[in-house]
Protein backbone atom coordinates (compact mmCIF):
# COMPACT_ATOMS: atom_id res chain seq x y z
CA UNK A 1 0.00 0.00 0.00
CA UNK A 2 1.44 3.36 -1.01
CA UNK A 3 0.64 6.28 1.25
CA UNK A 4 -0.01 9.36 -0.89
CA UNK A 5 2.54 12.17 -0.95
CA UNK A 6 -0.16 14.36 0.61
CA UNK A 7 0.09 12.18 3.72
CA UNK A 8 3.59 13.38 4.58
CA UNK A 9 2.57 16.97 3.77
CA UNK A 10 -0.33 16.48 6.17
CA UNK A 11 2.08 15.28 8.85
CA UNK A 12 4.15 18.42 8.44
CA UNK A 13 1.03 20.57 8.62
CA UNK A 14 -0.02 18.73 11.78
CA UNK A 15 3.33 19.53 13.40
CA UNK A 16 3.04 23.15 12.31
CA UNK A 17 -0.44 23.40 13.83
CA UNK A 18 0.77 21.84 17.06
CA UNK A 19 3.54 24.45 17.16
CA UNK A 20 1.05 27.27 16.55
CA UNK A 21 -1.26 25.96 19.29
CA UNK A 22 1.22 26.95 21.98
CA UNK A 23 -0.37 29.31 24.47
CA UNK A 24 2.29 29.63 27.14
CA UNK A 25 6.02 29.10 27.27
CA UNK A 26 7.37 25.73 28.31
CA UNK A 27 9.98 27.78 30.16
CA UNK A 28 7.42 28.69 32.81
CA UNK A 29 6.55 24.99 33.14
CA UNK A 30 10.01 23.41 33.34
CA UNK A 31 9.21 21.80 36.69
CA UNK A 32 6.06 20.21 35.23
CA UNK A 33 7.89 18.21 32.57
CA UNK A 34 7.52 14.47 32.82
CA UNK A 35 8.99 11.40 31.17
CA UNK A 36 6.01 9.67 29.59
CA UNK A 37 8.16 6.85 28.25
CA UNK A 38 7.41 7.14 24.55
CA UNK A 39 7.78 3.58 23.17
CA UNK A 40 10.34 4.61 20.55
CA UNK A 41 11.36 0.98 19.96
CA UNK A 42 7.86 0.28 18.62
CA UNK A 43 8.63 2.71 15.81
CA UNK A 44 12.06 1.28 15.05
CA UNK A 45 13.29 0.83 11.50
CA UNK A 46 13.49 -2.94 11.96
CA UNK A 47 9.75 -3.23 11.36
CA UNK A 48 8.27 -3.96 7.99
CA UNK A 49 5.88 -1.44 6.49
CA UNK A 50 3.02 -3.90 6.97
CA UNK A 51 3.64 -3.93 10.71
CA UNK A 52 4.08 -0.20 11.18
CA UNK A 53 0.91 1.02 9.45
CA UNK A 54 -1.46 -0.18 12.25
CA UNK A 55 0.92 1.20 14.92
CA UNK A 56 1.03 4.59 13.20
CA UNK A 57 -2.74 4.47 12.88
CA UNK A 58 -3.06 3.81 16.61
CA UNK A 59 -0.70 6.69 17.40
CA UNK A 60 -2.73 9.19 15.34
CA UNK A 61 -6.05 7.82 16.65
CA UNK A 62 -4.84 8.32 20.23
CA UNK A 63 -3.69 11.88 19.47
CA UNK A 64 -7.13 12.55 17.97
CA UNK A 65 -8.82 11.14 21.10
CA UNK A 66 -6.59 13.14 23.43
CA UNK A 67 -7.27 16.46 21.71
CA UNK A 68 -10.99 15.94 21.15
CA UNK A 69 -11.95 15.87 24.82
CA UNK A 70 -13.94 18.59 26.58
CA UNK A 71 -10.86 19.57 28.60
CA UNK A 72 -8.80 19.92 25.44
CA UNK A 73 -11.40 22.14 23.79
CA UNK A 74 -11.16 24.49 26.76
CA UNK A 75 -7.36 24.59 26.59
CA UNK A 76 -6.73 25.39 22.92
CA UNK A 77 -7.73 27.87 20.24
CA UNK A 78 -10.86 26.53 18.59
CA UNK A 79 -9.89 27.46 15.00
CA UNK A 80 -6.47 25.81 15.27
CA UNK A 81 -8.01 22.79 16.96
CA UNK A 82 -10.50 22.35 14.10
CA UNK A 83 -7.70 22.50 11.53
CA UNK A 84 -5.74 20.03 13.65
CA UNK A 85 -8.68 17.58 13.70
CA UNK A 86 -9.02 17.85 9.92
CA UNK A 87 -5.34 17.00 9.36
CA UNK A 88 -5.46 14.05 11.77
CA UNK A 89 -8.69 12.79 10.21
CA UNK A 90 -7.14 12.85 6.74
CA UNK A 91 -4.09 10.93 7.97
CA UNK A 92 -6.31 8.35 9.64
CA UNK A 93 -8.16 7.90 6.34
CA UNK A 94 -4.89 7.39 4.45
CA UNK A 95 -3.70 4.80 6.95
CA UNK A 96 -7.09 3.07 7.15
CA UNK A 97 -7.04 2.59 3.38
CA UNK A 98 -3.81 0.66 3.84
CA UNK A 99 -5.14 -1.36 6.78
CA UNK A 100 -8.30 -2.27 4.83
CA UNK A 101 -6.16 -3.54 1.98
CA UNK A 102 -5.11 -6.19 4.48
CA UNK A 103 -1.42 -5.47 4.23
CA UNK A 104 0.43 -7.76 6.59
CA UNK A 105 -2.62 -9.31 8.22
CA UNK A 106 -0.87 -12.65 8.50
CA UNK A 107 2.55 -11.23 9.34
CA UNK A 108 3.63 -11.29 13.02
CA UNK A 109 0.24 -10.22 14.42
CA UNK A 110 1.44 -10.69 18.00
CA UNK A 111 4.31 -8.28 17.55
CA UNK A 112 1.88 -5.75 16.09
CA UNK A 113 -0.58 -6.15 18.98
CA UNK A 114 2.21 -5.60 21.52
CA UNK A 115 3.24 -2.42 19.74
CA UNK A 116 -0.33 -1.12 19.64
CA UNK A 117 -0.70 -1.91 23.34
CA UNK A 118 2.54 -0.02 24.11
CA UNK A 119 1.19 3.04 22.29
CA UNK A 120 -2.11 2.83 24.18
CA UNK A 121 -0.30 2.60 27.53
CA UNK A 122 1.81 5.63 26.57
CA UNK A 123 -1.35 7.68 26.01
CA UNK A 124 -2.87 6.33 29.23
CA UNK A 125 0.16 7.76 31.06
CA UNK A 126 -0.39 11.12 29.37
CA UNK A 127 -4.11 11.12 30.25
CA UNK A 128 -3.33 10.22 33.87
CA UNK A 129 -0.74 13.01 34.06
CA UNK A 130 -3.26 15.59 32.80
CA UNK A 131 -5.81 14.34 35.32
CA UNK A 132 -3.31 14.52 38.19
CA UNK A 133 -2.30 18.03 37.15
CA UNK A 134 -5.98 19.01 36.93
CA UNK A 135 -5.62 19.92 33.24
CA UNK A 136 -3.60 23.01 34.13
CA UNK A 137 -2.19 25.24 31.34
CA UNK A 138 1.31 23.99 32.15
CA UNK A 139 0.21 20.35 32.00
CA UNK A 140 -1.31 20.93 28.58
CA UNK A 141 1.84 22.71 27.36
CA UNK A 142 3.99 19.78 28.54
CA UNK A 143 1.66 17.37 26.74
CA UNK A 144 1.63 19.49 23.56
CA UNK A 145 5.46 19.50 23.53
CA UNK A 146 5.56 15.76 24.18
CA UNK A 147 3.07 15.01 21.39
CA UNK A 148 5.07 17.16 18.99
CA UNK A 149 8.14 15.14 19.89
CA UNK A 150 6.54 11.70 19.63
CA UNK A 151 4.52 12.58 16.52
CA UNK A 152 7.70 13.84 14.88
CA UNK A 153 9.49 10.57 15.68
CA UNK A 154 6.64 8.52 14.21
CA UNK A 155 6.53 10.83 11.17
CA UNK A 156 10.25 10.24 10.64
CA UNK A 157 9.47 6.53 10.53
CA UNK A 158 6.87 7.11 7.80
CA UNK A 159 9.49 9.02 5.81
CA UNK A 160 12.06 6.26 6.23
CA UNK A 161 9.49 3.70 5.07
CA UNK A 162 8.77 5.81 1.99
CA UNK A 163 12.49 6.14 1.18
CA UNK A 164 12.95 2.35 1.43
CA UNK A 165 10.43 1.75 -1.34
Amino acid sequence: CDLPQTHSLGSRRTLMLLAQMRRISLFSCLKDRHDFGFPQEEFGNQFQKAETIPVLHEMIQQIFNLFSTKDSSAAWDETLLDKFYTELYQQLNDLEACVIQGVGVTETPLMKEDSILAVRKYFQRITLYLKEKKYSPCAWEVVRAEIMRSFSLSTNLQESLRSKE
Epitope: I24, S28, L30, A145
Partner: antibody, heavy 123, light 107 residues
Protein backbone atom coordinates in the same frame (compact mmCIF):
# COMPACT_ATOMS: atom_id res chain seq x y z
CA UNK B 1 16.27 27.57 6.72
CA UNK B 2 15.92 28.64 10.35
CA UNK B 3 18.04 31.71 11.00
CA UNK B 4 18.62 34.35 13.66
CA UNK B 5 20.36 37.50 12.45
CA UNK B 6 21.62 40.01 15.01
CA UNK B 7 22.39 43.72 14.81
CA UNK B 8 25.94 45.03 14.50
CA UNK B 9 28.63 45.81 17.09
CA UNK B 10 28.09 48.62 19.59
CA UNK B 11 30.45 50.81 21.61
CA UNK B 12 28.88 52.45 24.64
CA UNK B 13 29.95 54.61 27.57
CA UNK B 14 29.44 53.46 31.19
CA UNK B 15 25.93 54.30 32.41
CA UNK B 16 24.44 54.22 28.92
CA UNK B 17 22.02 51.64 27.48
CA UNK B 18 22.35 49.28 24.53
CA UNK B 19 19.59 47.67 22.48
CA UNK B 20 20.46 44.54 20.49
CA UNK B 21 18.08 43.11 17.91
CA UNK B 22 17.60 39.55 16.71
CA UNK B 23 15.58 38.90 13.55
CA UNK B 24 14.15 35.41 13.09
CA UNK B 25 13.31 33.74 9.79
CA UNK B 26 12.52 30.32 8.38
CA UNK B 27 10.03 29.25 11.06
CA UNK B 28 6.86 30.26 12.89
CA UNK B 29 8.25 33.13 14.98
CA UNK B 30 5.67 32.99 17.78
CA UNK B 31 6.02 29.22 18.31
CA UNK B 32 9.42 29.14 20.01
CA UNK B 33 11.09 31.04 22.83
CA UNK B 34 14.14 33.19 22.20
CA UNK B 35 16.89 33.27 24.79
CA UNK B 36 19.71 35.73 25.33
CA UNK B 37 23.15 34.52 26.37
CA UNK B 38 26.33 36.54 26.76
CA UNK B 39 30.03 35.76 26.80
CA UNK B 40 32.63 38.14 28.23
CA UNK B 41 36.10 38.04 26.58
CA UNK B 42 37.83 34.76 27.46
CA UNK B 43 34.94 33.75 29.73
CA UNK B 44 32.14 31.21 29.70
CA UNK B 45 28.48 31.45 28.69
CA UNK B 46 25.98 33.28 30.87
CA UNK B 47 22.21 33.12 30.42
CA UNK B 48 20.54 36.54 30.54
CA UNK B 49 16.90 35.65 30.00
CA UNK B 50 14.20 34.59 27.58
CA UNK B 51 11.10 35.90 25.84
CA UNK B 52 8.05 34.10 24.50
CA UNK B 53 7.42 35.99 21.23
CA UNK B 54 3.76 34.98 21.26
CA UNK B 55 2.71 36.40 24.63
CA UNK B 56 5.64 38.66 25.41
CA UNK B 57 6.26 36.70 28.63
CA UNK B 58 9.84 37.21 29.82
CA UNK B 59 12.09 35.75 32.48
CA UNK B 60 15.55 37.00 33.39
CA UNK B 61 18.39 35.82 35.59
CA UNK B 62 18.45 37.69 38.91
CA UNK B 63 21.80 39.28 38.02
CA UNK B 64 20.10 41.21 35.20
CA UNK B 65 16.69 41.90 36.72
CA UNK B 66 15.95 45.61 36.75
CA UNK B 67 18.57 46.25 34.06
CA UNK B 68 17.36 44.10 31.18
CA UNK B 69 14.26 44.57 29.04
CA UNK B 70 13.29 42.03 26.41
CA UNK B 71 10.65 42.93 23.86
CA UNK B 72 9.40 41.64 20.52
CA UNK B 73 7.85 42.93 17.32
CA UNK B 74 5.77 40.15 15.76
CA UNK B 75 5.24 42.16 12.56
CA UNK B 76 8.96 41.98 11.78
CA UNK B 77 9.73 38.69 13.63
CA UNK B 78 12.30 40.53 15.71
CA UNK B 79 13.16 40.39 19.40
CA UNK B 80 15.12 43.03 21.27
CA UNK B 81 17.28 42.94 24.37
CA UNK B 82 18.02 46.25 26.06
CA UNK B 83 20.59 46.44 28.84
CA UNK B 84 20.78 49.66 30.85
CA UNK B 85 23.25 51.20 33.33
CA UNK B 86 26.12 49.64 31.43
CA UNK B 87 29.43 49.03 33.15
CA UNK B 88 32.77 47.74 31.87
CA UNK B 89 31.90 44.19 33.02
CA UNK B 90 29.08 44.18 30.47
CA UNK B 91 31.62 44.12 27.64
CA UNK B 92 30.77 40.86 25.92
CA UNK B 93 29.40 39.12 22.87
CA UNK B 94 25.61 38.89 23.17
CA UNK B 95 23.85 35.97 21.49
CA UNK B 96 20.20 35.28 20.84
CA UNK B 97 19.27 31.60 20.59
CA UNK B 98 16.07 29.68 19.99
CA UNK B 99 14.93 26.14 20.59
CA UNK B 100 13.46 24.71 17.42
CA UNK B 101 14.22 20.98 17.50
CA UNK B 102 11.39 19.03 19.07
CA UNK B 103 13.52 16.95 21.40
CA UNK B 104 15.68 19.96 22.18
CA UNK B 105 12.54 21.99 22.93
CA UNK B 106 11.44 19.56 25.61
CA UNK B 107 14.88 19.61 27.19
CA UNK B 108 15.37 23.31 26.52
CA UNK B 109 18.60 22.98 24.58
CA UNK B 110 19.37 26.00 22.37
CA UNK B 111 19.82 24.62 18.87
CA UNK B 112 19.74 27.76 16.70
CA UNK B 113 22.01 30.73 17.48
CA UNK B 114 22.50 34.21 16.12
CA UNK B 115 25.99 35.23 14.98
CA UNK B 116 26.54 37.34 18.10
CA UNK B 117 26.72 41.09 18.74
CA UNK B 118 29.84 42.57 20.33
CA UNK B 119 29.07 45.24 22.91
CA UNK B 120 32.02 47.20 24.22
CA UNK B 121 31.59 49.42 27.27
CA UNK B 122 34.42 51.91 27.58
CA UNK B 123 34.88 55.47 28.73
CA UNK C 1 20.46 28.71 41.43
CA UNK C 2 21.85 25.41 40.25
CA UNK C 3 25.64 25.48 39.93
CA UNK C 4 27.26 23.50 37.14
CA UNK C 5 30.88 22.43 37.61
CA UNK C 6 32.88 21.12 34.69
CA UNK C 7 36.16 19.25 34.84
CA UNK C 8 38.81 19.47 33.69
CA UNK C 9 38.86 23.15 32.73
CA UNK C 10 41.30 22.27 29.95
CA UNK C 11 42.93 19.18 28.49
CA UNK C 12 45.46 18.32 25.83
CA UNK C 13 44.79 15.40 23.54
CA UNK C 14 45.83 13.97 20.19
CA UNK C 15 43.76 13.10 17.12
CA UNK C 16 42.28 9.64 17.65
CA UNK C 17 42.23 9.91 21.45
CA UNK C 18 39.16 9.13 23.53
CA UNK C 19 38.21 12.25 25.48
CA UNK C 20 35.92 12.45 28.51
CA UNK C 21 34.56 15.64 30.05
CA UNK C 22 32.50 15.62 33.23
CA UNK C 23 29.83 17.97 34.49
CA UNK C 24 28.42 18.00 38.01
CA UNK C 25 25.23 19.76 39.12
CA UNK C 26 24.82 21.19 42.63
CA UNK C 27 21.49 19.35 42.90
CA UNK C 28 19.70 16.62 40.98
CA UNK C 29 18.63 17.78 37.52
CA UNK C 30 17.25 14.43 36.32
CA UNK C 31 18.33 14.24 32.64
CA UNK C 32 17.78 17.90 31.82
CA UNK C 33 21.33 18.49 30.65
CA UNK C 34 22.63 19.77 27.31
CA UNK C 35 26.15 19.90 25.84
CA UNK C 36 27.54 22.55 23.48
CA UNK C 37 30.68 22.95 21.42
CA UNK C 38 32.13 26.39 20.75
CA UNK C 39 34.95 27.37 18.45
CA UNK C 40 36.79 30.75 18.71
CA UNK C 41 34.74 33.62 17.29
CA UNK C 42 31.73 31.39 16.66
CA UNK C 43 28.38 30.85 18.35
CA UNK C 44 27.95 27.69 20.46
CA UNK C 45 26.55 24.59 18.75
CA UNK C 46 24.19 22.14 20.46
CA UNK C 47 25.70 18.64 20.48
CA UNK C 48 23.60 16.67 22.94
CA UNK C 49 20.29 17.30 24.70
CA UNK C 50 18.52 15.27 27.39
CA UNK C 51 21.93 14.07 28.68
CA UNK C 52 22.37 11.49 25.91
CA UNK C 53 20.31 12.39 22.81
CA UNK C 54 22.46 13.32 19.84
CA UNK C 55 21.37 16.50 18.10
CA UNK C 56 20.62 16.09 14.40
CA UNK C 57 23.72 16.36 12.22
CA UNK C 58 26.18 15.77 15.07
CA UNK C 59 28.71 12.95 14.43
CA UNK C 60 28.15 9.72 16.36
CA UNK C 61 31.62 9.91 17.94
CA UNK C 62 30.00 12.31 20.42
CA UNK C 63 27.99 10.70 23.20
CA UNK C 64 26.56 11.76 26.52
CA UNK C 65 25.59 9.88 29.65
CA UNK C 66 24.49 10.40 33.22
CA UNK C 67 21.49 11.53 35.23
CA UNK C 68 20.89 13.19 38.57
CA UNK C 69 24.02 15.17 39.35
CA UNK C 70 26.82 13.54 37.34
CA UNK C 71 27.14 13.72 33.57
CA UNK C 72 29.76 12.85 30.99
CA UNK C 73 30.48 13.94 27.42
CA UNK C 74 32.66 11.50 25.50
CA UNK C 75 34.38 11.93 22.16
CA UNK C 76 35.28 8.38 21.12
CA UNK C 77 37.98 9.31 18.61
CA UNK C 78 39.04 12.94 18.58
CA UNK C 79 39.09 14.58 15.15
CA UNK C 80 40.97 17.77 14.14
CA UNK C 81 37.67 19.71 13.98
CA UNK C 82 36.83 18.73 17.59
CA UNK C 83 39.43 21.02 19.15
CA UNK C 84 37.15 23.55 20.82
CA UNK C 85 35.59 24.52 24.14
CA UNK C 86 32.70 22.40 25.49
CA UNK C 87 29.97 23.60 27.85
CA UNK C 88 27.25 21.80 29.77
CA UNK C 89 23.94 23.54 30.55
CA UNK C 90 21.11 22.57 32.85
CA UNK C 91 17.49 23.15 31.87
CA UNK C 92 15.94 21.64 34.97
CA UNK C 93 14.89 24.94 36.51
CA UNK C 94 15.34 28.66 35.91
CA UNK C 95 17.71 30.39 35.70
CA UNK C 96 19.41 28.27 33.02
CA UNK C 97 23.04 27.83 34.02
CA UNK C 98 26.17 26.73 32.17
CA UNK C 99 29.30 24.98 33.30
CA UNK C 100 32.57 26.93 33.18
CA UNK C 101 33.70 25.17 30.02
CA UNK C 102 36.39 22.66 29.05
CA UNK C 103 38.94 23.66 26.46
CA UNK C 104 40.20 20.74 24.37
CA UNK C 105 43.61 21.58 22.95
CA UNK C 106 46.03 19.82 20.62
CA UNK C 107 48.79 17.94 22.43
Amino acid sequence: QVQLVQSGAEVKKPGASVKVSCKASGYSFTSYDINWVRQAPGQGLEWIGMINPSSGFTSAAQTFQGRVTMTRDTSTSTVYMELSSLRSEDTAVYYCATIKGLGAYYYYGMDVWGQGTTVTVSS
Amino acid sequence: DIQMTQSPSSLSASVGDRVTITCRASQSIDRYLNWYQQKPGKAPKLLIYAASSLQSGVPSRFSGSGSGTDFTLTISSLQPEDFATYYCQQSYSPPLTFGGGTKVEIK
